[in-house]
Interface confidence: low
């Protein structure tokens, strides 16, 4: 499965958009893990609404957001106040029972150095900024310049 | 100003290795990906790789992957070209470019080193 | 990979007139959830690397002269130079920036009738 680089500046929020088959995976719960090593298991950050019908409301655990939007085949994930320490890879996953299918690999990437004036505001960022099939980012500012890495076919 | 400049290009037999740098001013280097684009003399533009602003992730084109490493010195707002195993076909001026900033453009690049050559013969 | 295939190989244009290139991509870089084109265009002077000047296919870069424009979606793509200049005469390729790996178009050579 393809894997999406996401960069995002430490301190800002990182919103990252997985979208999926609405009818594939009608009725099925979303989640966001972080998978520990290459070939290690995938650590459960935080899942939508135990009741599918209610998986558009935020849920939250601590500085990780998510809400599914059903109808649009599209939940999201918010990262907010990013940090060193959330850089590493994450999956986006269907529930099915026991069973979680990998709809997106995303590979976070925390910068920590704030961009000079000169290179703010040369490119425009708009609010809901995406990136790339399977994968979105929004960043809390528009002065961001970081290029997404899409995904490999 | 964006500056890009390239060295480290020259003549190699086949087999052979072959470093290229590209020195990087005028904008804050750790904060962009970059990448390495060739042309053969003659031909058209080829990508050859691409390296995220951390160095955390990278990217190959198959006519290069496990042959070329692509890396970098943000202290030194340097990238690195190692080209090991090298080929006739590796012939080519290869070009250190900036990925335009912004995360919903993609990887377009913008601006573009004057280029190295580098001749892959015996 | 995305195919990227260019027409004509090479085209001649009088000084004025209008100067088209074709560019087909083998799948979509139409990015739904934006609806945009990861399409970009480049001039190659003789001599000179490369420079940018159209991404998201019809999004020219600052500082290009709006005589070049583009145009198109989905697999099929058009860059207009419409009053060519002698400063326009160059290798013209084009570019998906949609998905890696990155792959250009032939190029299309450009010169004065």
């Known amino acids: 499965l393809n894997t999406t680089v996401l960069q995002g500046m430490a301190g800002q929020s990182l919103r990252v958009s997985c979208t999926y088959d609405a009818l594939k995976h009608w009725g099925r719960r979303k989640a966001w893990c972080r998978q520990l090593g290459e070939e290690g298991p995938c650590q459960r950050v935080v899942s939508t609404h135990g009741v599918w019908l209610l998986a558009f409301l935020k849920k939250r655990n601590g500085s990780t957001v998510i809400a599914d939007d059903t109808l649009a085949g599209t939940v999201t994930i918010t990262l907010k106040n990013l940090q060193a320490g959330d850089a590493g890879l994450y999956q986006c996953q269907s529930l099915r029972g026991r069973e979680a299918e990998v709809l997106q690999k995303v590979l976070v990437e925390v910068l920590e150095d704030p961009l000079d004036d000169q290179d703010a505001g040369d490119l425009w960022v708009p609010e809901e900024s995406s990136s790339f099939e399977g994968a979105q980012v929004e960043h809390s500012t528009s002065r961001n310049q970081e290029t997404s890495f899409p995904p490999t076919s | 100003e964006v500056q890009l400049l390239e060295s480290g290009g020259g003549l190699v037999q086949p087999g052979g290795s072959l470093r290229l740098s590209c020195a990087a001013s005028?904008?804050?280097?750790?904060?962009?990906?970059m990448s390495w684009v060739r042309q053969a003399p003659g031909k058209g533009l080829e990508w050859v790789s691409a390296i995220s602003g951390s160095g955390g992730s990278t990217y190959y084109a198959d006519s290069v992957k496990g042959r070329f490493t692509i890396s970098r010195d943000n202290s030194k707002n340097t990238l690195y070209l190692q080209m090991n195993s090298l080929r006739a076909e590796d012939t080519a001026v290869y070009y250190c470019?900036?990925?335009?900033?912004?995360?919903?453009?993609?990887?377009?690049?913008?601006?573009w080193g004057q280029g190295t050559l580098v001749t892959v013969s015996s | 990979d995305i195919v990227m295939t260019q027409s004509p190989d090479s085209l001649a244009v009088s000084l004025g007139e209008r100067a088209t290139i074709n560019c087909k991509s083998s799948?979509?870089?139409?990015?739904?959830?934006?609806?945009?084109?990861?399409l970009a265009w480049y001039q190659q002077k003789p001599g000179q690397p490369p420079k940018l000047l159209i991404y998201w296919a019809s999004t020219r870069e600052s500082g290009v002269p709006d005589r070049f424009s583009g145009s198109g979606s989905g697999t099929d793509f058009t860059l207009t130079i419409s009053s060519l200049q002698a400063e326009d005469v160059a290798v013209y390729y084009c570019q998906q920036h949609y998905i890696w790996p990155i792959t250009f178009g032939g190029g299309t050579k450009v010169e004065i009738k």
């Open positions: 799948q979509s870089v139409l990015y739904s959830s934006n609806n945009k084109n990861y």
């Open positions: 470019a900036k990925l335009r900033g912004g995360y919903e453009v993609g990887p377009t690049f913008d601006p």
């Open positions: 005028g904008f804050t280097f750790s904060n962009y990906a």
